[in-house]
Amino acid sequence: VEVQVSEDPVVALVDTDATLRCSFSPEPGFSLAQLNLIWQLTDTKQLVHSFTEGRDQGSAYSNRTALFPDLLVQGNASLRLQRVRVTDEGSYTCFVSIQDFDSAAVSLQVAAPYSKPSMTLEPNKDLRPGNMVTITCSSYQGYPEAEVFWKDGQGVPLTGNVTTSQMANERGLFDVHSVLRVVLGANGTYSCLVRNPVLQQDAHGSVTITGQPLTF
């Protein structure tokens, strides 16, 4: 028996359902009584879901997995993972045994988009050219960790005096806070781009300082 899976990682958004595709080519006369199907975590060998002795043995993994029972006889051994969490990310191995056996691994990549950044300025009044200001760009509830880029009004990257920190909450999602310290010119726009490297999603925030008032 030959097992086939997608070579590309399956990308799933947090809280959505994902299908990890796995298939085999059944011989003529194949019946489910002959099938032993096991899904497990590749690295830890933890059992995720199994079909043995002619029946679905159910989920061994937080009761959020399911097979496609009506399609098994056609060779579809795919696994449905419901309400995806950050902790589900990783490699899953599909083992199929009929008379001989084969296995293949498929990667699940979890992602969550970042919120539109909020911008704060310190100090936020009585600003004059030559003043040192701290601009903070904050974006929330994304995964995996973000790349953060700062640019001035002309699109020139600002790389000096940038400190970026990531905070993971209980669900494993990141809040990113990036701080730019800059000396004010006569006026200027400072923009922050928060990029999710998996989704290639960019979230933008900017602040324009024109004497007074401030524009966010």
Epitope: T42, D43, V86, T87, E89, G90, S91, A105, S107, Q109, Y143, P144, E145, E147, S165, Q166, M167, A168, N169, E170, G172, L173, F174, P197, V198
Partner: antibody, heavy 121, light 108 residues
Framework: DVQLVESGGGVVRPGESLRLSCAAS????????MNWVRQAPGEGLEWVSR?????????YYADSVKGRFTISRDNSKNTLYLQMNSLRAEDTAVYYC?????????????WGLGTLVTVSS | EIVLTQSPGNLSLSPGERATLSCRAS??????LGWYQQKPGQAPRLLIY???TRATGIPDRFSGSGSGTEFALTISSLQSEDFAVYYC??????????FGGGTKVEIK
């Protein structure tokens, strides 16, 4: 079994460079963030650097090494690297390679045995 | 940077006794805290993550508790192999990922 094996340590003079390697096995290397943690003789643990998983190449450094050290990984070789330039006496330590337990929780569930770097004139 | 302060610095106890180690964070780290054991000449070993979850293969005499800024590692009945240095580490707000200064548990 997960194994992390560091190499490349040695004795160098201040200002010189050294490249550490960490060969990983027993897990899907590309799926995990990796770190370097060091321990000066008789002292506590100090996190040095982290590189996130896959090929996204997002890196972080302790202030004490920023601009001098570069972390990188070769997922095809299951190997983590630390390029150390402009070494100082205070960089003398055992350098451990450590695997992040998950990509959102940066505890270190597996460690190598370490490689000793001595910076001395 | 979040600073972790461990106390006491040294703890002298006899085998069979209960050990309680403390770790205090300079600001809340939620439950994003780990505990490690290190013996002389060896690499650290993960004991606890998520403040209270035992790592794979860790005996149940080790338990972690706390959240926010106050954490504890308890060894219910010290075995000879438990005499070592213990470190806490936060992974809530980073970089940097920070460790406490360590508590040395030694035989009385």
């Amino acid at each position: 079994d997960v194994q992390l094996v560091e190499s490349g340590g040695g004795v160098v003079r201040p200002g010189e460079s050294l490249r550490l390697s960490c060969a990983a096995s027993g897990f899907t290397f590309s799926n995990y963030a990796m770190n370097w943690v060091r321990q000066a003789p008789g002292e506590g643990l100090e996190w040095v650097s982290r590189i996130n998983y896959k090929g996204y190449n997002i890196t972080y450094y302790a202030d004490s090494v920023k601009g001098r050290f570069t972390i990188s990984r070769d997922n095809s070789k299951n190997t983590l690297y630390l390029q150390m330039n402009s070494l100082r006496a205070e960089d003398t330590a055992v350098y451990y390679c450590a695997k992040s337990g998950s990509n959102s929780n940066n505890f270190f569930d597996y460690w190598g045995l370490g490689t000793l770097v001595t910076v001395s004139s | 940077e979040i600073v972790l302060t461990q106390s006491p610095g040294n703890l002298s106890l006899s085998p069979g006794e209960r050990a309680t180690l403390s770790c205090r964070a300079s600001q809340s780290v939620g439950s994003q805290l780990g505990w490690y054991q290190q013996k002389p000449g060896q690499a650290p070993r993960l004991l606890i993550y998520g403040a209270s979850t035992r790592a794979t293969g860790i005996p149940d005499r080790f338990s972690g508790s706390g959240s926010g800024t106050e954490f504890a590692l308890t060894i219910s009945s010290l075995q000879s192999e438990d005499f070592a240095v213990y470190y806490c580490q936060q992974y809530y707000d980073w970089p940097p990922l920070t460790f406490g200064g360590g508590t040395k548990v030694e035989i009385k």
